[in-house]
């Protein structure tokens, strides 16, 4: 039997190709030369080596670069990249948009792990901010992603690259995510005219204050319930039943649906009755009439 | 949803050839190996080899070699698979299947299996 | 080759009982094993990959379990349409192959 360390007669690659499927794992690690499959790692991804087959694979480019890959070979990892792991991610330098986009179609189709994670914070981190053109790439894989960076790190993203952002991109954002993509929407859209830009800023509209949603109530956007549900409770409660009137337009009459669910609820709390019947939708749980609404959170902020 | 749908039986003598055909749709043709395995009547699963179709580049397991030929034609989403030289042992169900994952070769989706009769 | 050795040949377990397959693999396959079953006249459909991960859709009373040269299947409460030949697969290297199968019948 020949000794695993020494590579039998005649089975040293010259190239890699597809006759390397057949070599066991001892073979290619006695086989196969590192340099060689550095140069040539663009065939790799072309050839379906098993996943113990890239464990040695690995180990040969783990040896070959010690201090991290070149990006000319991360390029063309391809399944390579499923398993590597954060740390070794960590050492690498991604400046491209190109091997980003190659590394992230390996994953398509799967969650956000660990090592995709990691490259995207590399590659960020690299650009010094999240561009337009980033932003587009990593919406398109993984839509979600958007809302699973911190407040602290969506401020680091420009205006500009709201463009990029689908409503479903913001699905899964928080109140504190909204609050700090609201302000960038609103200068990004700044320059459209009212129904385009309420089309725009929808989606964002979680983070929305009061005065810009009195603000919008003055244009006749009509906002579907499903919108208004997701506006900021602390937002919603200073605005009138008749500015709630003009915001939601014909989708007033959801209200009834919605009375016992936040904000509507909160909000109906606060309205006086007499305003809340003018509605015609039997909303109950208004301020009876004659009762007076005294502010005590204002009457605070004065002393 | 995934379909791979075969031609239908053959009957061959022996030494003569016969060419089975795979036709692919809902998915991209081009994106996945398509490989070709045979059952022999009341055996196990033989995996006979692969072709990608977007680089027509192919393996065949060793015991075929010389005798298998597998191809595509791209613009009907149609993989097919040629054995010559037939053999009464050569009797057996062939079936198309492809692998989602290359660097986990199991068998995503299969073909409904083409039976080939060798006999005199 | 690495050669997938299954036993037994064929099983006879009552409806709702339990159901136990083993296949054992000629090398240290790791992890790299996948379980289809064939029903009479069918191509084989995918149970289980990774020796343990259920495939989309199929029923958790199948179950895979084992690693390095010995895996095993088992179905927790055999039920009627669960009546099959089933076989196992090694993907840790190519050629890749079989097991000769087990045909599993209603006692």
């Known amino acids: 039997e020949v000794e695993k360390t020494a590579c039998p007669s005649g089975k040293k690659a010259r190239e890699i190709d597809e006759s390397l499927i057949f070599y066991k794992k001892w073979e290619l690690e006695a086989c196969v030369d590192a340099a060689l499959l550095a140069t040539q790692m663009d065939r790799v991804n072309a050839i379906p080596f098993t996943y113990e087959q890239l464990d040695v694979l690995k180990h040969k480019l783990d040896e070959l670069y010690p201090q991290g890959y070149p990006e000319s070979v991360i390029q063309h990892l391809g399944y390579l990249f499923l398993k590597m792991s954060p740390e070794d991610i960590r050492k690498w330098n991604v400046t491209s948009l190109e091997t980003l986009k190659a590394l992230l179609e390996v994953n398509k189709g799967h969650e956000m792990s660990p090592q995709v994670a990691t490259l995207i914070d590399r590659f960020v981190k690299g650009r010094g901010q999240l561009d337009k053109d980033t932003l587009d790439t990593l919406t398109a894989f993984y839509p979600g992603y958007l809302c699973s960076l911190s407040p602290e790190e969506l401020s680091s993203v420009p205006p500009s690259s709201i463009w990029a952002v689908r409503p479903q991109d913001l699905d899964t954002c928080d109140p504190r995510q909204l609050d700090v993509l609201y302000p960038k929407a609103r200068l990004a859209f700044q320059n459209m005219n009212g129904s385009e830009y309420f089309v725009k800023i929808q989606s964002f509209l979680g983070g929305a204050p009061t005065e810009d949603l009195k603000a919008l109530s003055q244009q006749n956007v009509s906002m579907d319930l499903a919108t208004f549900m997701k506006l900021r409770t602390d937002a919603v409660l200073p605005l009138t039943v008749a500015e709630v009137q003009k915001l939601l337009g014909p989708h007033v009459e959801g209200l009834k649906a919605e009375e016992r669910h936040r904000p509507v609820r909160d909000w109906i709390l606060r309205q006086r009755q007499d305003d809340l019947d003018t509605l015609g939708l039997g909303l109950q749980g208004g301020i009876p009439n004659g009762y007076l609404v005294l502010d005590l959170s204002m009457q605070e902020a004065l002393s | 949803q995934v379909q791979l749908v075969q031609s239908g039986a053959e009957v061959k003598k022996p030494g003569a050839s016969v060419k089975v055909s795979c036709k692919a749709s809902g998915y991209t043709f081009t994106s996945y190996w398509m490989h070709w395995v045979r059952q022999a009547p009341g055996q196990g699963l033989e995996w006979m080899g692969w072709i990608h179709p977007n680089s027509d580049n192919t393996i065949y397991y060793e015991k075929f070699q010389g005798r298998v030929t597998m191809t595509v034609d791209k613009s009907i989403s149609t993989a097919y698979m040629e054995l010559s030289r037939l053999r009464s042992d050569d009797t057996a169900v062939y079936y198309c299947?492809?692998?989602?994952?290359?660097?986990?070769?199991?068998?995503?989706?299969w073909g409904q299996g083409t039976l080939v009769t060798v006999s005199s | 080759d690495i050669v997938m050795t299954q036993s037994p040949d064929s099983l006879a377990v009552s409806l709702g009982e339990r159901a136990t397959i083993n296949c054992k693999a000629s090398?240290?396959?790791?992890?790299?094993v996948a379980w289809y079953q064939q029903k009479p006249g069918q191509s084989p459909k995918l149970l289980i990959y990774?020796?343990?991960t259920r495939h989309t859709g199929v029923p958790d009373r199948f179950t895979g379990s084992g690693s390095g040269t010995d895996f095993t299947l088992t179905i927790s409460s055999l039920q009627a349409e669960d009546v099959a030949v089933y076989f196992c697969?090694?993907?840790?290297?190519?050629?890749?192959?079989f097991g000769a199968g087990t045909k599993l019948e209603i006692k």
């Open positions: 090398h240290d396959v790791g992890t790299s």
């Open positions: 697969q090694q993907y840790s290297s190519y050629p890749l192959t």
């Open positions: 990774w020796a343990s």
């Open positions: 299947a492809i692998i989602i994952t290359p660097v986990v070769p199991k068998f995503d989706y």
